[in-house]
Interface confidence: low
């Protein structure tokens, strides 16, 4: 708490300018009017205040706006944003994307801090859903942002926002998250032609069901092994050898290197060995010739 002292004669600040960097903390407290500071917040960022001086300026704003800062002030906080606590930020009502961008810019290049996480949470809740422009902005600053959301939070992402998603934004997503995102991507890209569609949908295929993989196998898409290895095991298992061959195209040869890893390993166990042999890759572990394959899941459904 800064002690209340009278402002020395002639030191009353008429505007926020560089001369204030020579003020001691108590002089800033005594001589800078909080309302003046609020209206000239945009100047603070250009002045090399010390961290101690910024503490005083924050204290003045806190006194002026005990219920939380107005957006006109928030937008121009600049480096003063780094002084805010999550508790401070929870009092804010941030609705402008420009405000969000301005504050994210301050934290650019750093890990997502609790302050930033709180800010984003406030902003998204205020908007009601993650619209395209917001998602575009957040993933530009934090590529892993999307995968930090729970499946429940992802459900509020409208299909239109999927256009903003880049492949690297999905790198750390787990299958549960892709299960939510894939149907949205399928809707978003539904009118694209085959090759363009595959380029866009590829990153989301970790959430694709079997019937969609079967459909893709008819479209000469030549899926690479890295994408195939990220597919849901339960979606890959029902695919026939012919379908996998069509799906992978020239990349089918890569199955040999992955035969001990899921989902390839589990898929091999479900195929007839003579079907696997048609690939000419030396894949082993299929069902020997002459064995009968019972689909137990179908039996359970009938019983």
């Amino acid at each position: 708490e800064v002690e209340k002292t009278a402002c020395p004669s002639g030191k009353k600040a008429r505007e926020i300018d560089e001369s204030l960097i020579f003020y001691k903390k108590w002089e800033l407290e005594a001589c800078v009017d909080a309302a003046l500071l609020a209206t000239q917040m945009d100047r603070v960022n250009a002045i090399p205040f010390t961290y101690e001086q910024l503490d005083v300026l924050k204290h003045k704003l806190d006194e002026l706006y005990p219920q939380g800062y107005p957006e006109s002030v928030i937008q121009h906080l600049g480096y003063l944003f780094l002084k805010m606590s999550p508790e401070d930020i929870r009092k804010w009502n941030v609705t402008s994307l420009e405000t969000l961008k301005a504050l994210l810019e301050v934290n650019k290049g750093h890990e997502m801090s609790p302050q930033v996480a709180t800010l984003i949470d406030r902003f998204v809740k205020g908007r009601g859903q993650l619209d395209k422009d917001t998602l575009d902005t957040l993933t530009a600053f934090y590529p892993g942002y999307l995968c930090s959301l729970s499946p429940e939070e992802l459900s509020s992402v409208p299909p239109s926002s999927i256009w903003a998603v880049r492949p690297q934004d999905l790198d750390t997503c787990d299958p549960r998250q892709l299960d939510v995102l894939y149907p949205k991507a399928r809707l978003a890209f539904q009118n694209m032609n085959g090759s363009e569609y595959f380029v866009k949908i590829q990153s989301f295929l970790g959430g694709a069901p079997t019937e969609d993989l079967k459909a893709l196998s008819q479209q000469n898409v030549s899926m690479d092994l890295a994408t195939f290895m990220k597919l849901r095991t339960d979606a890959v298992l029902p695919l026939t050898v012919a379908e996998v061959q069509k799906l992978l195209g020239p990349h089918v040869e890569g199955l040999k290197a992955e035969e001990r890893h899921r989902p390839v390993r589990d898929w091999i166990l479900r195929q007839r060995q003579d079907d696997l042999d048609t690939l000419g890759l030396g894949l082993q572990g299929g069902i020997p010739n002459g064995y009968l394959v019972l689909d137990l899941s179908m039996q359970e459904a009938l019983s």
């Epitope: 859903q129 619209d131 395209k132 422009d133 409208p158 299909p159 239109s160 890209f189 009118n191 694209m192």
Partner: antibody
Framework: QIQLVQSGPELKKPGETVKISCKAS????????MNWVKQAPGKGLKWMGW????????SYADDFKGRFAFSLETSASTAYLQINNLKNEDMATYFC???????????????WGAGTTVTVSS | DVLMTQTPLSLPVSLGDQASISCRSS???????????LEWYLQKPGQSPKLLIY???NRFSGVPDRFSGSGSGTDFTLKISRVEAEDLGFYYC?????????FGGGTKLEIK
Amino acid sequence: QIQLVQSGPELKKPGETVKISCKASGYTFTHYGMNWVKQAPGKGLKWMGWINTYTGEPSYADDFKGRFAFSLETSASTAYLQINNLKNEDMATYFCARRRDYGTSHWYLDVWGAGTTVTVSS
Amino acid sequence: DVLMTQTPLSLPVSLGDQASISCRSSQSFVHSNGNTYLEWYLQKPGQSPKLLIYKVSNRFSGVPDRFSGSGSGTDFTLKISRVEAEDLGFYYCFQGSHVPYTFGGGTKLEIK
């Protein structure tokens, strides 16, 4: 068939407000952004901005920030353009035009309304 | 903002001639999805504009094949191989990649 039907011509005095409607039919309203284009008498086309019919979020060109407002009545598949505090330079024909804003890489203004003429005269 | 400049302002032609309209942008406008959203529209007197060409060179459905679009970077061209009477009117180029989207100033195609 797919069409955009705009409200009729308006005669207003300077300082008044006008609200133009653009009713869409024959397609899913929320799958296309609604754009607004101004054409002053004897002049070219000027893009005013658009409204995302999915999220309701408007985007304005710099010359149309302030007195101009885009809005929606999604249940009626209708977009609106409101101009406040009319000035003589607002006298023009205003077109609405749909533009796909997601779901395909083919984005274009493929369906246009017939235009609404706004006359400003004291 | 991307400024679109069309030339010529007026293009007098004889029916059956080839017509060529140029559109130059102040900067390149490739969208982040890799597409260049350059479109051409025709507006006849008393009518709303009609889409002719999208994504630089793709003819919109129902547009006769005498219309063709080309170009890249900042220079784009609309060509009409054999002008017919129904082609007369004002032609506008339009970039829809970067907000604010912008139209060119227009070119009047008229009979010589």
